[in-house]
């Protein structure tokens, strides 16, 4: 099988740029989703965000986030998600396990799922950026 070593030194500043881009795109997605009136956030859905037992940027649950956003893309044709997925793939290791998402079938519940996950994704990217910048500050002190 394919075991060639890959030499790749990625400065933390570059990772930060990816997360900044994701943060900006998450706000665009949320703004788009919030245009749908009369939809309430649900307590039934939780987007995995940061793992406490890993260092930034590997503490971001990128594979799971990708799976949730891919589900939204299938439920509602939001083209910004394509770009979000491309940037998440910069953080996802090529052998990361797949995440299965149970998709709501009811139309209104689908809308609640989309709003809830979009909101959590936006909050998650804010947290991820904070964890990156605080990690960088700790590394320099």
């Amino acid at each position: 099988s394919h075991t060639l070593p890959v030499r790749l030194l990625r400065p933390s500043d570059d990772v930060q740029k990816i997360v900044e881009e994701l943060q900006s795109l998450s706000k665009m997605l949320l703004k788009d989703v919030e245009e749908e009136k009369g939809v309430l956030v649900s307590q039934n859905y939780t987007l995995p965000c940061l793992s406490p037992d890993a260092q930034p940027p590997n503490n971001i649950h990128s594979p799971a986030i990708r799976a949730y956003l891919k589900t939204i893309r299938q439920l509602d044709n939001k083209s910004v998600i394509d770009e979000i997925i491309e940037h998440l793939d910069k953080l996802i290791f090529q052998d990361a396990p797949e995440t299965n998402i149970s998709v709501p079938t009811d139309t209104h519940e689908c809308k609640r799922f989309i709003l809830t996950i979009s909101q959590q994704f936006s909050e998650c990217m804010d947290l991820a950026l904070k964890s990156l910048t605080s990690g960088a500050q700790q590394a320099t002190t």
């Epitope: 099988s1 793939d89 953080l91 996802i92 090529q94």
Partner: antibody, heavy 122, light 107 residues
């Protein structure tokens, strides 16, 4: 070692379609983007599109949107690029390319197919 | 789409010369850039990825660097076997466009 083997040369009539295959072997990764690139005689490299075979997710160049379809068969590790409504300007060598690297997103395309020459002529 | 402007389109230099080729991105691509070498009638070969990391088996005379949105491929001492066309390609977001290419010849 990753190997990409493409289908053989094709001669097509204007208005018809062509489907080029690219069979990959020698890798274990599941998360990756494979790209398709073409090169007209004496011209530069032109990006056509990409596929994420694990999910069949695709991205296309605006120039080819509506005319190109990229698919993948996970069971045979084969990607396909179909170009429709062919015209003489589509005469080119078509390449598939595959990345190395620790992440799902590519940094560069380390492995290339041998190229498939497509000639469009009446 | 992000545009990649490559210069010069062609150059002629003597064996042993230092050669530089530049690609300018129309927006910040944060090192997501690769350089390829293509010899006449051959398949493109990856030289540099992630702006400055050498691909396996690439001679040390090839190197990549970055200044802002300008990315440079340098051949420190041109060899006869380096006669080829060189292309850059970005991977920041699709479409992953290529530069127009630089044809390198020996004087």
């Amino acid at each position: 070692q990753v190997q990409l083997v493409q289908s053989g040369a094709e001669v097509k009539k204007p208005g018809s379609s062509v489907k080029v295959s690219c069979k990959a072997s020698g890798y274990t990764r599941t998360r990756y983007w494979m790209q398709w690139v073409r090169q007209a005689p004496g011209q530069g490299l032109e990006w056509m599109g990409a596929i994420y075979p694990a999910e069949g997710d695709t991205r296309y160049s605006q120039k080819f949107k509506g005319r190109v379809t990229i698919t993948a068969d996970k069971s045979t590790s084969t990607a396909y690029m179909e170009l429709s409504s062919l015209r003489s300007e589509d005469t080119a060598v078509y390449y598939c390319a595959f990345p190395e690297g620790p992440y799902a997103a590519p940094y560069g395309m380390h492995y290339w197919g041998q190229g498939t020459t497509v000639t469009v002529s009446s | 789409a992000i545009q990649m402007t490559q210069s010069p389109s062609s150059l002629s230099a003597s064996v042993g010369d230092r050669v530089t080729i530049t690609c300018r991105a129309s927006r910040n691509i944060h090192n997501y850039l690769a350089w390829y070498q293509q010899k006449p009638g051959k398949v493109p070969k990856l030289l540099i990825y992630y702006a400055k990391t050498s691909a396996s088996g690439v001679p040390s005379r090839f190197s990549g660097s970055r200044s802002g949105t300008d990315y440079t491929l340098t051949i420190s001492s041109l060899q006869p076997e380096d006669v080829a066309t060189y292309y850059c390609q970005h991977f920041w977001k699709t479409p992953w466009t290529f530069g127009g290419g630089t044809k390198v010849e020996i004087k």
